[in-house]
């Protein structure tokens, strides 16, 4: 019997200082570039080596960025989201959603990764 894959979703506020080469990551998503089915949100697709995000260490590929400096990223065109980051200033506050994959044991049995009970 196959194990069940669950996701643990957490949110975090990440404050980055723009480095000499910028913030140091790529994004995908937007209303005109849906990366996840039925979700026009903005996701991190690449963390650049030695960039500000990589050196900070908290932002991860696959994270969903919910807001930039308090501005919601819902219902934005892809390029508008890119421009928002580029114009965000020196100190940039990101509200992000991490989605951690949790592998549980077979259905009907409690596996090591299952906190229930």
């Amino acid at each position: 019997m196959n194990g069940r894959v669950d996701y643990l979703v957490t949110e975090e506020e990440i404050n980055l200082t723009r480095g000499p080469s910028g913030l140091g990551f790529n994004i995908v998503g937007g209303t005109d570039q849906q990366y996840v089915s039925n979700d026009s949100g903005i996701y991190v697709s690449r963390i650049k080596e030695n960039g500000a995000a990589a050196l900070d260490g908290r932002l991860q590929e696959g994270d969903k960025i919910l807001s930039v400096n308090g501005q919601d990223l819902k219902n934005l065109l892809h390029q508008d989201a890119v421009d928002l980051f580029r114009n965000a200033g020196y100190a940039v506050s990101l509200r992000v959603q991490h989605r951690l994959q949790v592998q549980n044991g077979p259905i009907g049995h409690r596996g090591e990764g299952d906190p229930s009970g």
Epitope: S21, G22, L23, G24, F25, N26, I27, V28, D32, Q33, Y35, S45, R46, K48, H78, Q79, V82, F85, R86
Partner: nanobody, 127 residues
């Protein structure tokens, strides 16, 4: 893991044309920023052209402007380089490159560090 496979290279006379193709793996090809670079023997890898995820923006090296055209077909996971009026100095191995998504920083299409994935290359020889 993204895989890129170039094809379409060959031997052509000066003034002739070739169309290079790059086939990319991955279900999210439509989010990739794509580029072509080239490397001649004994020289450094040189930027040729790049194209944004939806084809809305294209970028060219001065040496190929007006002769080369980059375009893509997201339905087929393909990017192309149409090369016209070829010159002997265009002789090189041509490489396809990809970055997943768009940088949130200022984009330098000619910087190889902008791209994560590279093909093995296809030889173009202009006699």
């Amino acid at each position: 893991e993204v895989q890129l496979v170039e094809s379409g290279g060959g031997l052509v006379q000066a003034g002739g044309s070739l169309r290079l193709s790059c086939a990319a793996s991955g279900r999210t090809f439509s989010t990739y920023t794509m580029a072509w670079f080239r490397q001649a023997p004994g020289k450094e890898r040189e930027f040729v052209a790049a194209i944004s995820w939806n084809g809305g923006s294209t970028y060219y090296a001065d040496s190929v402007k007006g002769r080369f055209t980059i375009f893509r077909d997201n339905a087929k996971n393909m990017v192309y380089l149409q090369m016209n009026n070829l010159k002997p100095e265009d002789t090189a191995v041509y490489y396809c490159a990809a970055a997943i998504g768009s940088t949130v920083d200022s984009y330098d299409p000619g910087d190889p560090l902008e791209y994560d994935y590279w093909g093995q290359g296809t030889q173009v020889t202009v006699s």
